[in-house]
Interface confidence: low
Amino acid sequence: SSPTSSASSFSSSAPFLASAVSAQPPLPDQCPALCECSEAARTVKCVNRNLTEVPTDLPAYVRNLFLTGNQLAVLPAGAFARRPPLAELAALNLSGSRLDEVRAGAFEHLPSLRQLDLSHNPLADLSPFAFSGSNASVSAPSPLVELILNHIVPPEDERQNRSFEGMVVAALLAGRALQGLRRLELASNHFLYLPRDVLAQLPSLRHLDLSNNSLVSLTYVSFRNLTHLESLHLEDNALKVLHNGTLAELQGLPHIRVFLDNNPWVCDCHMADMVTWLKETEVVQGKDRLTCAYPEKMRNRVLLELNSADLDCDPILPPSLQTS
């Protein structure tokens, strides 16, 4: 059920009006069929209606547009381009609408769009120019401040013959349009790695959520340029250890809070630097909850309670005795 507010009096369009108005130009600020509208609250909700396309007759006053729980499949170029433009649209939520393709320029002509949520869509084909709108090497800056892309990974059999991480990163970096992005959420996307150049080109980031992925290592990732970063969520990944370079970079960020819970930390000799760092640092939230997963003899030991004597490595076997 749609939330209501004292600030809003939602008017609903009856489904039978759809065919009646489609042949003629839309009335000014009418409410699209299958949607609920509140001019006072500048809000349009077309939620759980199985819509297959973005309504053409969105009212010009809309600031908050909820198109969740539909069956949109494709967002074409200019999906929200209107005449006059939707100049006030600031928050656009398209989560859970079965989108599998977002084309170049899908969000063009939305000069005030600050918050975009594409979560829970199986995006097999995200154009590199979905957010930048053009293939210029430097595009006009996007007004986006928050981009929510949680659980957009398609099923294995629907992925193109390319890296999903690479596809997403290409869209984030195209034309350097997202230089003003402050919040980026990429949770639950089966990311195995983070391409090394992505963070360097998003210098305004305050909040980065990479939780519930499959990140094994941050060795080639640099956080050095993210001087404004306030929260870094790395919970529920496959991290084994953080190495010195990463530790130093994180420690050098003035406002950072790092979340590292539920990673399979390997407590051997390579963990010594991280344990020392954990004991000294204030940047890791809930650091007392971090426990070893491997080797077996160390399982469930608290990292903060380890000392150098606990952290040993088995001697390397000669090649003739090694097994795969």
Partner: antibody, heavy 121, light 107 residues
Framework: EVQLLESGGGLVQPGGSLRLSCAAS????????MSWVREAPGKGLEWVSA????????YYADSVKGRFTISRDNSKNTLYLQMNSLRAEDTAVYYC??????????????WGQGTLVTVSS | DIQMTQSPSSLSASVGDRVTITCRAS??????LNWYQRKPGKAPKLLIY???SLQSGVPSRFSGSGSGTDFTLTISSLQPEDFATYYC?????????FGQGTKLEIK
């Protein structure tokens, strides 16, 4: 009827901790961003922190960043503010408020009655 | 962060007067501005949102205008219950700041 009821305020020493709660009723809690606003004695309203409906996004005023943590339990219709390393200047009445609209185009349409936090030795 | 500056800080007026309070933003905030009324011992109350929209249940003597950096709250004919402190708040920025308040007192 929308209702917001704060609790958890009280007297605490500098450096201490306190956890405020805000019990919400009368609306679909998980659909709305929520926030904490405070008013110190003789001072104006100060926006403290906000959190999205899902709880995935948090926002903090510079004055409390790193010391306060906002959270919510949508199954219990409850908003929280964990306040650590409290200072005398955190003394205030703390209000929870409901946001209407997307975070960047929002307004606070319902407010609780507030709970007093006093930080003093 | 975006700074909000209200003027005047305090103001004396009589019942029936027309009163205007202004709010200036340190950068353009489009029309992402709200006005609240605060009375001692009471929770703040939303009066105007999105610069000019009157909140449900608020008397029509209250009105808001402005866009960009300069905004105005007007009370067309002051009533005894209107003596309070008024705050503007921007929600354009990443952090949602209030003005310092304008205290409206009886002359």
């Amino acid at each position: 009827e929308v209702q917001l009821l704060e609790s958890g305020g009280g007297l605490v020493q500098p450096g201490g901790s306190l956890r405020l709660s805000c019990a919400a009723s009368g609306f679909t809690f998980s659909s709305y961003a929520m926030s904490w606003v405070r008013e110190a004695p003789g001072k104006g309203l100060e926006w403290v922190s906000a959190i999205s409906g899902s709880g995935g996004s948090e926002y903090y005023a510079d004055s409390v960043k790193g010391r306060f943590t906002i959270s919510r339990d949508n199954s219990k219709n409850t908003l929280y503010l964990q306040m650590n390393s409290l200072r005398a200047e955190d003394t205030a009445v703390y209000y929870c408020a409901r946001y209407y609209g997307g975070y960047y185009s929002a307004w606070m349409d319902y407010w609780g009655q507030g709970t007093l936090v006093t930080v003093s030795s | 962060d975006i700074q909000m500056t209200q003027s005047p800080s305090s103001l004396s007026a009589s019942v029936g007067d027309r009163v205007t309070i202004t709010c200036r933003a340190s950068q353009s905030i489009s029309s992402y501005l709200n006005w609240y009324q605060r009375k001692p011992g009471k929770a703040p109350k939303l009066l105007i949102y999105a610069a000019s929209s009157l909140q449900s249940g608020v008397p029509s003597r209250f009105s808001g205008s402005g866009s960009g950096t300069d905004f105005t709250l007007t009370i067309s004919s002051l009533q005894p219950e209107d003596f309070a402190t008024y705050y503007c708040q921007q929600t354009y920025g990443y952090l949602h700041t209030f003005g310092q308040g304008t205290k409206l007192e009886i002359k």
